[in-house]
């Protein structure tokens, strides 16, 4: 079986305050089964940005229809960007586990930084 890879193609994403940012993430395999989550930062203090499985994330939408059984695109859009949103965002695959899912593989991360102000 092909080993799952997490692809985040952009190392750096320049964004504009008030606009929508798109963070790209694709996987190369559907297996092992388990959810994909987005975090800002690393380590125990990382901030959950989006959980495919559950939760309410009013500023986040997915680019693709995650209910497709063959979906491999876990890209997200974050609306109404503010300076507080800057940081490095990681797309992380978990494999199912009991009682807790287990982190399986992380993307390399995309750094979100503020670009020029709109004229």
């Amino acid at each position: 079986e092909e080993e799952l890879q997490m692809i985040q193609p952009e190392k750096l994403l320049l964004v504009t305050v008030g606009k929508t940012a798109t963070l790209h993430c694709t996987v190369t395999s559907l297996l092992p089964v388990g959810p994909v989550l987005w975090f800002r930062g690393v380590g125990p203090g990382r901030e959950l940005i989006y959980n495919q499985k559950e939760g309410h994330f009013p500023r986040v939408t997915t680019v693709s229809d995650l209910t497709k059984r063959n979906n491999m695109d876990f890209s997200i859009r974050i609306s109404s960007i503010t300076p507080a949103d800057v940081g490095t965002y990681y797309c992380v695959k978990f494999r199912k586990g009991s009682p807790e899912n287990v982190e399986f593989k992380s993307g390399p991360g995309t750094e979100m930084a503020l670009g020029a102000k709109p004229s």
Epitope: L31, V33, P35, E54, T67, K68, S98
Partner: antibody, heavy 118, light 107 residues
Framework: DVQLVESGGGVVRPGESLRLSCAAS????????MSWVRQAPGKGLEWLAG????????YYIDSVKGRFTISRDNSKSSLYLRMNSLTAEDTAVYYC???????????WGLGTLVTVSS | ALTQPASVSANPGETVKITCSGG??????YAWYQQKSPGSAPVTVI????ERPSDIPSRFSGSASGSAATLIITGVRVEDEAVYFC???????????FGAGTTLTVL
């Protein structure tokens, strides 16, 4: 409360067609994949078909592929199953079910009975 | 195909375990569905191996390891008498399957 109500069942002759409907309420229908599952008299559950939230992707068990068609109308919060060339083996209670994020089922309708008999 | 025992029985208050085998842990998620009479609407008591819907009593729990899943009813009650179907979703084939059902009798 989540509610799924099937309709369209009845008695048909072998070779005929039928369209089942499932009216959904109590949740954002357009955000959930949906499926049809049936249960023949005295038998277990059998998954038939599933459809993605947007309706673009459909999935079938091999035994009904090409004969059954699953579809949905998100503007009406409705799910459908078109069944062609029915045989006695299609006699069953047909349930619609809402899918979880990982394509299991969390809510079920009450079912509608389809009887195929000459 | 998913395999489960045809029947189990228990006295009220006992712990019941129903096993379901045949799935691949790497690619399969399991669920458990309760049906109190033939042709009545199934009720999901466990999905995603071990997640219990909010309206299901805490005496129902689930687990999965290797190629098997287990439904556990701790302190079984007379009203738990039903047929329990295990179900699986296989991420490799995109197909849902069910076991044949286990009839739980509470003596």
């Amino acid at each position: 409360d989540v509610q799924l109500v099937e309709s369209g069942g009845g008695v048909v002759r072998p070779g005929e067609s039928l369209r089942l409907s499932c009216a959904a309420s109590g949740f954002t229908f357009s955000s959930h994949a949906m499926s049809w599952v049936r249960q023949a008299p005295g038998k277990g559950l059998e998954w038939l078909a599933g459809i993605s939230a947007g309706g673009s992707d459909t999935y079938y068990i091999d035994s009904v592929k090409g004969r059954f068609t699953i579809s949905r109308d998100n503007s009406k919060s409705s799910l459908y199953l078109r069944m062609n060339s029915l045989t006695a083996e299609d006699t069953a209670v047909y349930y619609c079910a809402r899918e979880t994020w990982n394509h299991l089922f969390d809510y079920w309708g009450l079912g509608t009975l389809v009887t195929v008999s000459s | 195909a998913l395999t489960q025992p045809a029947s189990v029985s228990a006295n009220p208050g006992e712990t019941v375990k129903i096993t379901c085998s045949g799935g691949d842990y790497y690619s399969t998620y399991y669920a458990w569905y309760q049906q109190k009479s033939p042709g009545s609407a199934p009720v999901t008591v466990i999905h995603s191996d071990d997640e219990r819907p909010s309206d299901i009593p805490s005496r129902f729990s689930g687990s999965a390891s290797g190629s098997a899943a287990t439904l556990i009813i701790t302190g079984v009650r007379v009203e738990d008498e039903a047929v329990y179907f295990c179900g699986g979703y296989d991420g490799r084939t995109y197909i849902n399957t069910f076991g044949a059902g286990t009839t739980l009798t509470v003596l």
